[in-house]
Interface confidence: low
Amino acid sequence: MFSHLPFDCVLLLLLLLLTRSSEVEYRAEVGQNAYLPCFYTPAAPGNLVPVCWGKGACPVFECGNVVLRTDERDVNYWTSRYWLNGDFRKGDVSLTIENVTLADSGIYCCRIQIPGIMNDEKFNLKLVIKPAKVTPAPTRQRDFTAAFPRMLTTRGHGPAETQTLGSLPDINLTQISTLANELRDSRLANDLRDSGATIRIGIYIGAGICAGLALALIFGALIFKWYSHSKEKIQNLSLISLANLPPSGLANAVAEGIRSEENIYTIEENVYEVEEPNEYYCYVSSRQQPSQPLGCRFAMP
């Protein structure tokens, strides 16, 4: 029974809930190009960190079966059919795999090798290759290679008349919602409808804030446990029900969205999951839901 678990076990189990490993699924058809998104936000333009892509889940260190590697400034290793199609200098290290076959199915590791002990960001992305559909009439492919990066760039105020959404200044949760409304009828929305792509918004937040929220969640859970125990109304409270509390503000956002991995704290948000041609949604979802592919992200300073 949950109420009789030692306090240390409760904390440990809560911590495990907060640090679930992420594995998101992506699909492509044989013969198409597969697109596996991976991003980070350089501390300053050009201040890049090494990144490796490997076939297989992320090991403790480095990448296994490396297919592409960057250093602080350069792509220093790549193999045929694997390349970076995006704006590498601005932190878009998304991997494109050309002309995929069934053998390309599996887990891929994107490892962002942030300086410091055990600071690496690790992303496991599951690629599922489906046999090519045989259709008599030509249909527009859902080519993520083409579709996804289009969301990244708007004409704007960059040094060469280009602005990347990933570098918009001072964006916050309220502005994300506003942005969603402003873009609903825009050309970008039309692109989204055409491509079926999604935009991932990842917001980097100070570790202190996250720690505070995590503590608040733990305190809330303990108070809830105490309340339940004292009222003797709930004899069995499982971790499953704890993890699936209905959406109720920040506590749920922390439970569902914060991933504490090594020393990096991230809230992942999913904006514009395109369900139907003219329906656009802006909502928070946990990165652990494999049915919802991740797209691009904004970064808070």
């Epitope: 400034r73 350069d74 494109t96 760039t153 060469a160």
Partner: antibody, heavy 122, light 111 residues
Framework: EVKLLESGGGLVQPGGSLKLSCAAS????????MSWVRQAPGKGLEWIGE????????NYTPSLKDKFIISRDNAKNTLFLQMSKVRSEDTALYYC???????????????WGQGTSVTVSS | DIVLTQSPASLAVSLGQRATISCRAS??????????MHWYQQKPGQPPKLLIY???NLESGIPARFSGSGSRTDFTLTINPVEADDVATYYC?????????FGGGTKLEIK
């Protein structure tokens, strides 16, 4: 063998428009950033702009942004430069160029076409 | 924009001697210790040809007589020894920041 062949140059009147093409062969065009560079007679090189593999990012030198449009057709392995509102100072040899790595736009340009000449005169 | 200033504008060197061309950037073209400065050679009637990339890396097929050095804002192209075939105009170019920019060029002649 990598080949870049520019075409579409010629004589154009001030204020007029012209569309230059660059036909690429010998490499997977759809994987490369591509650039346009121009050179006025007896002058140095001037970078016009670049386009990424799927046309989602196009960077221009600011002074030319309102006059020139860079585009590409990966199915036809062709890069384009649409020139408008041309003036005499746009008279130049126009080169298309390709960087040395196919996934990253910050590299030096290791392949160049022979250029196509544009003369703006009334 | 990053302005690249090449000097000298023209240079006459005897065969077998050393030629040194300088390129100064108005701001650093370095990031994480790597310099995004490149050198090109252009002969009359021909397109530019890449000689050196990222300050000091010799492009494939280019003779070892050509070398590059420098970091941040000051860069040098050295040709040693100069041969008759080296008569051309040499340009530096930075790709650290859009818009990419070229230097004004240095014309190398033989004494």
């Amino acid at each position: 063998e990598v080949k870049l062949l520019e075409s579409g140059g010629g004589l154009v009147q001030p204020g007029g428009s012209l569309k230059l093409s660059c036909a690429a062969s010998g490499f997977d065009f759809s994987r490369y950033w591509m650039s346009w560079v121009r050179q006025a007679p007896g002058k140095g090189l001037e970078w016009i702009g670049e386009i990424n593999p799927d046309s989602s990012t196009i960077n221009y030198t600011p002074s030319l942004k309102d006059k020139f449009i860079i585009s590409r057709d990966n199915a036809k392995n062709t890069l384009f430069l649409q020139m408008s509102k041309v003036r005499s100072e746009d008279t130049a040899l126009y080169y298309c160029a390709r960087p040395s790595y196919d996934g990253y736009y910050g590299y030096a340009m290791d392949y160049w076409g022979q250029g196509t000449s544009v003369t703006v005169s009334s | 924009d990053i302005v690249l200033t090449q000097s000298p504008a023209s240079l006459a060197v005897s065969l077998g001697q050393r030629a040194t061309i300088s390129c100064r950037a108005s701001e650093s073209v370095d990031s994480y210790g790597k310099s995004f400065m490149h050198w090109y050679q252009q002969k009359p009637g021909q397109p530019p040809k890449l000689l050196i990339y990222r300050a000091s890396n010799l492009e494939s097929g280019i003779p070892a007589r050509f070398s590059g050095s420098g970091s941040r804002t000051d860069f040098t192209l050295t040709i040693n020894p100069v041969e008759a075939d080296d008569v051309a105009t040499y340009y530096c170019q930075q790709s650290n920041e859009d818009p990419y920019t070229f230097g004004g060029g240095t014309k190398l002649e033989i004494k």
